[in-house]
């Protein structure tokens, strides 16, 4: 079906980790030969249309806004392109999660939060009273779903050897395998500072 064409992209213009009732803009890569672009959500192996954009001449990539994010809107999204009456192309998939459905977990560190490049740190996400199956560690400002994920309880996330790019604000979330797109309220934040200057003064607050 795809022939020699690369798979078109789908992307979120902001974080795909979206607070309950928040919003996100989704962009589908424009395809020259498509006269219609549809945004679909995939639920239980069935596709449901969320929105559609007709092709206009020299138009930029079609965008769709998901408003009032909730449990029904969390999940896997795909762009569907109509090439002809019976011809379709599909983009890659995008996963959106909604946060704020359960009580929060707790994020802690095994050492101070100011690091030198090359050092190691482990962040632990725990929830003594809510039996989450899994935890995800998110860095503020990232435009993709958190790569750090654990099925342990508590969950240990090893960061390191660190470089300057590791600096940032981290939070963790708890969730259940049965509902992988429905996440907890965010944990407390931890700000990691990676600096190659030992003369800087940094303070952290709890």
């Amino acid at each position: 079906q795809e022939g020699d064409f690369p798979m078109p992209f789908i992307s979120a213009k902001s974080s795909p980790v979206i607070p309950l009732d928040g919003s996100v803009k989704i962009q589908c890569q424009a395809i020259r030969e498509a006269y219609l672009t549809q945004l679909m959500i995939i639920k239980n192996s069935t596709y449901r249309e969320i929105g559609r954009r007709l092709k206009f001449w020299n138009e930029t990539d079609p965008e769709f806004v998901i408003d009032h994010m909730d449990a029904n809107k969390a999940g896997r999204y795909q762009c569907q392109y109509r090439i002809g009456h019976y011809r379709f192309r599909y983009s890659d998939t995008l996963e959106l999660v909604v946060t704020g459905l359960y009580g929060k977990p707790f994020l802690s560190a095994d050492r101070g939060l100011v690091l030198m490049p090359g050092e190691n740190i482990s962040l632990t996400c725990s929830s003594a009273h809510i039996p989450f199956d899994r935890f995800s560690l998110a860095k503020e400002g990232e435009l993709s779903l958190p790569q750090h994920q654990s099925g342990e309880h508590p969950a240990n996330f090893s960061l390191g050897p660190v470089d300057l790019n590791v600096s940032g604000i981290y939070r963790c979330y708890g969730w259940y395998n049965r509902s992988p797109y429905l996440w907890s309220f965010p944990s407390n934040a931890l700000e990691l500072v990676v600096t190659d200057s030992i003369h800087q003064d940094y303070t952290t607050q709890n």
Partner: antibody
Framework: QVQLVESGGGVVQPGRSLRLSCAAS????????LHWVRQAPGKGLDWVAV????????YFADSVKGRFTISRDNSKNTLYLQMNSLRAEDTAVYYC????????????WGQGTLVTVSS | AIQLTQSPSSLSASVGDRVTITCRAS??????LAWYQQKPGKAPKLLIY???SLEGGVPSRFSGSGSGTDFTLTISSLQPEDFATYYC?????????FGPGTKVDIK
């Protein structure tokens, strides 16, 4: 010591608006999740709304959804509850509540401010 | 929403009595339950969190137990300052909910 002091309550007519404030002191305000909880005269406790430490995550009870908004100003150590389209059943003492740092129980409560909705 | 029911709704007891209050959740909440004490005209005060952990500064005569759907608050020897209304609260999932309360008064 931790202090939460609510203000802005009073008597208001049905359909009108009111904004409650909660001034916090004695802790690092920007690190804590905060809630509003209310209690109608002679009745039990009723959870109203929550806001995350950075203000991004919010959640409301169904009874106030679409009418109340919660916000915070971390530079002023203040929590707000904007109440629109008030109804008689919104009459209550409104408490500003701090959530525990490591879990979602309520470890500190303000003294409350009374909102009376009456014509 | 998860519903919490408390029993009894009120009870009369004497100083020195052992008092037990129960809280039942409409679905499992693991140990995500807290207990609060409220006296007339005052704000509630946290006693127990995580079903069984005693909040700092709370007398050891208060204890909590249970997990899943059934929880208990016990006052081992009732003191004059314990006459109040007690509420359970679940923090497992939003919206957070409270039980209707149990009023403990003097026999």
């Amino acid at each position: 010591q931790v202090q939460l002091v609510e203000s802005g309550g009073g008597v208001v007519q049905p359909g009108r608006s009111l904004r409650l404030s909660c001034a916090a002191s004695g802790f690092t305000f920007s690190s804590y999740v905060l809630h509003w909880v209310r209690q109608a005269p002679g009745k039990g406790l009723d959870w109203v709304a929550v806001i995350s430490d950075d203000g991004r995550n919010k959640y409301f009870a169904d009874s106030v959804k679409g009418r109340f908004t919660i916000s915070r100003d971390n530079s002023k150590n203040t929590l707000y509850l904007q109440m629109n389209s008030l109804r008689a059943e919104d009459t209550a003492v409104y408490y500003c509540v701090r959530e525990g740092y490591s879990g979602s129980w309520f470890d500190y409560w303000g003294q409350g401010t009374l909102v009376t909705v009456s014509s | 929403a998860i519903q919490l029911t408390q029993s009894p709704s009120s009870l009369s007891a004497s100083v020195g009595d052992r008092v037990t209050i129960t809280c039942r959740a409409s679905q499992g909440i693991s140990s995500a339950l807290a207990w609060y004490q409220q006296k007339p005209g005052k704000a509630p005060k946290l006693l127990i969190y995580g079903a069984s952990s005693l909040e700092g500064g709370v007398p050891s005569r208060f204890s909590g137990s249970g997990s899943g759907t059934d929880f208990t608050l016990t006052i081992s020897s009732l003191q004059p300052e314990d006459f109040a209304t007690y509420y359970c609260q679940q923090f497992n999932s939003y919206p957070f909910t409270f039980g209707p309360g149990t009023k403990v008064d003097i026999k």
